[in-house]
Amino acid sequence: PLATIPVSTTSLTSSEGSTISTPSVDISTPVTTSIVGDQCSRCKNGGFWDGLKCQCLTPYYGESCEEVVNSIDIAPPETVSAQMELTVTVTSVKFTDELKNHSSQEFREFNKTFTEQMNIVYSGIPEYVGVNITNLRLGSVVVEHDVLLRTKYTPEYKTALDNATEVVKQKITKVTTEQIMTNDNCSALMCFNTTGTQVQNITVTQYDPVEECRQKAEEYEDYFLVEYRDQKPYCISPCESGFNASKNCNHGKCQMSQNGARCLCVTTETHWYSGEDCNQGTQKSHHHHHH
């Protein structure tokens, strides 16, 4: 037998004028269901039957995956980072082939000293994480290395990281201009050749909540948008309440369709409501129209 569920019906009229009846289930009554037919066809919009219920794909939900969610989870990374590829020339150490071997005493000591020097240079930059030597070559010692920067994700993370990369450039330029060999003498932890300082490349984490929102919304991408609350991005449709872009359906229910959000207006015992925002009420008995 098919499921028999006690139902009370509320009549909903779309803003175009058609009346839709939506069942509201009386959950106090025990429900017994026995589904007849092929379950695969029951799950719409790419959803699949797991033996108990439809497993819906984003952005769908509902018994048959026929409804569109009002908000989609988007998860920006906790932190975002930048990697700067730099080259400096250290003049206070003689190059030997042993520096090529990362397990040698020469490399370990050079790495330790260089890292300590850079930690001092960049100590005032909150985003600074550390340095990583990628290659050492002759001339005295040409040090190819990465400067790693990291910050908490905020909507302005790109600006924060861009600013930090500028400060890195300023600080490395300053130290490699000031800490130089004078009369074959270096009175610093490390000395440099000013002309050997170069920024080769800067890579910044790319995270765009709008792009993630659009991708997850699929064919509804034009109707979902990103709004921020406490610097956290939310991917919402106009049917999600409490945001600037929220649609006010007054005496109605917001529903997403492939043409965007629309209001389904309710008909009560005393009134029927119409209009794009279901804000035009007409009294049934007197046919009195008011706003």
Epitope: T91, S92, V93, K94, F95, T96, Q105, E106, E109, F110, K112, T113, S140, M181, D184, N185, C186, S187, A188, L189, C191
Partner: nanobody
Framework: EVQLVESGGGLVQPGRSLRLSCAAS???????MGWFRQAPGKEREGVAG???????GYADSVKGRFTISRDNAKNSLYLQMNSLRAEDTALYYC???????????????????RGQGTMVTVSS
């Protein structure tokens, strides 16, 4: 890691001499070596430095009185201190640079290894 152990400190009268030694656990051939000192309540100061090829440098306060030398075969560093003064009283320790360090006959940069020190007290 290079371990450095100083010896030769002690109590000496003004005008007398002392010879400090520093024994290194590893090869010091390609390292700059130096002596530093720190008097109670004062900043650490460089006393003398020597490059791997034997070029030396001294603090103005000890020039003509102290001599730094090294014996690479013995992995040892020495500081001959003559005409000692009360103001030479301090903890003296030896230090070793990064391998293949150049331009290091002066003393204001940081060495990467240093010993625990030996106390020199100049008093009558």
């Amino acid at each position: 890691e290079v371990q450095l152990v100083e010896s030769g400190g002690g109590l000496v009268q003004p005008g007398r001499s002392l010879r400090l030694s520093c024994a290194a656990s590893g090869d010091i051939t390609r390292r700059c070596m130096g002596w530093f000192r720190q008097a109670p309540g004062k900043e650490r100061e460089g006393v003398a430095g020597i490059s791997e090829d034997g070029i030396t440098g001294y603090a103005d306060s000890v020039k003509g009185r102290f001599t730094i030398s090294r014996d690479n075969a013995k992995n040892s560093l020495y500081l001959q201190m003559n005409s000692l003064r009360a103001e030479d009283t301090a903890l003296y320790y030896c230090a070793a640079s990064i391998l293949n360090r150049v331009g290091c006959r002066q003393l204001s940069y940081e060495y990467i290894y240093r010993g625990q020190g030996t106390m020199v007290t100049v008093s009558s």
